[in-house]
Amino acid sequence: FERTRSLQDPCSNCPAGTFCDNNRNQICSPCPPNSFSSAGGQRTCDICRQCKGVFRTRKECSSTSNAECDCTPGFHCLGAGCSMCEQDCKQGQELTKKGCKDCCFGTFNDQKRGICRPWTNCSLDGKSVLVNGTKERDVVCGPSPADLSPGASSVTPPAPAREPGHSPQ
């Protein structure tokens, strides 16, 4: 079948990185500069993508593959092949389908990427909250009440009403 196909269509013999040049008796010609063909048998080469402005080159164009872009620092890619750049979220936010959203109460994100994670539950380790959590920071767990200096109350006071910045016990 391949032999029959190549007899019928000489262009099928042209490998990636070349095109079947109708102007030169269907000879396989190399793709011109700044163009590529990623598959064999193509009658034209595609123009290489140029990574400009907020887009920067992640991978240079070659005769057989297109250039690949990513975004300049402070931005990240959106879409197939990085067609758009979106500003990184701030600490205390996470990226959702609708963009950057503040972390919900009881969660935090200390990075500009990734998702909001639940505050550490200090009581699971028998510890108490030393520093309250925020949208940007996890709670800091302190020693358990029993570890406190002699004479200190070993009774944990009742948890206050839930307010922003307080870890649920």
């Epitope: 140029q50 400009k52 402005g53 907020v54 959106l78 067609s83 758009m84 750049c85 979106e86």
Partner: antibody, heavy 116, light 107 residues
């Protein structure tokens, strides 16, 4: 904050040229392509082209290719769009816009009136 | 060039109404679709990018959806400040092209 401030309204005669400026502030000018879009009275938005301030490289809409020139002066964070051989149907508001694959910030627009 | 067909070209609605505007591309634009609002004074603002992502500061009553060639902008409960003209725009290929616009007027 990020801002694009354009030059003032212009009145030109047919056959003349107009040069509209767009001054950027609040961000690194060279880091983002600047696009130009126009809107004729009562009409929709029409993309004219773009310039990469870092290199000066341009992409033009074929419709304007032989009449438009986009330039920039990085020292004053300003992009320019010059349209030559003006006709009455070039009467429009011309906008510059910063590009991230979408136009997140637009200039206030510059009205260019072409009239004899 | 990729043609963008927006409908309706105009609509009348009341405050509190749910409004839907559609945009159809002449070929698959792989979600590279943005929506803009233009107030009568001429100022243009980005509302939604990459089909559904809300630009910072845009109220959550605005939402976008779609894929392939068909896209939608929805205003869940129209407010007085939403009376304006809305444009879709594709970023899949140069030249960037816009829909013809939808003017949202007070009924």
């Amino acid at each position: 904050q990020v801002q694009l401030v354009q030059s003032g309204a212009e009145v030109k005669k047919p056959g003349a040229s107009v040069k509209v400026s767009c001054k950027a502030s609040g961000y690194t000018f060279a880091g983002f392509e600047m696009h130009w879009v126009r809107q004729a009275p009562g009409q929709g938005l029409e993309w004219m082209g773009a310039i990469d301030p870092k290199t000066g490289g341009t992409d033009y809409n074929q419709k304007f290719k032989d009449r438009v020139t986009m330039t920039r002066d990085t020292s004053i964070s300003t992009a320019y769009m010059e349209l030559s051989r003006l006709r009455s149907d070039d009467t429009a508001v011309y906008y510059c816009a910063r590009d991230l694959g979408y136009f997140d910030v637009w200039g206030q627009g510059t009205l260019v009136t072409v009239s004899s | 060039d990729i043609q963008m067909t927006q409908s309706p070209s105009s609509l009348s609605a009341s405050v509190g109404d749910r409004v839907t505007i559609t945009c159809r591309a002449s070929q698959d634009i792989r979600s590279n679709l943005n929506w803009y609002q233009q107030k009568p004074g001429g100022a243009v603002k980005l509302l939604i990018y990459y089909t559904s992502r809300l630009h910072s500061g845009v109220p959550s009553r605005f939402s976008g959806s779609g894929s392939g060639t068909d896209y939608t902008l929805t205003i869940s409960s129209l407010q007085p400040e939403d009376f304006a003209t809305y444009f879709c725009q594709q970023s899949e290929k140069l030249p960037r092209t816009f829909g013809g616009g939808t003017k949202v007027e007070i009924r």
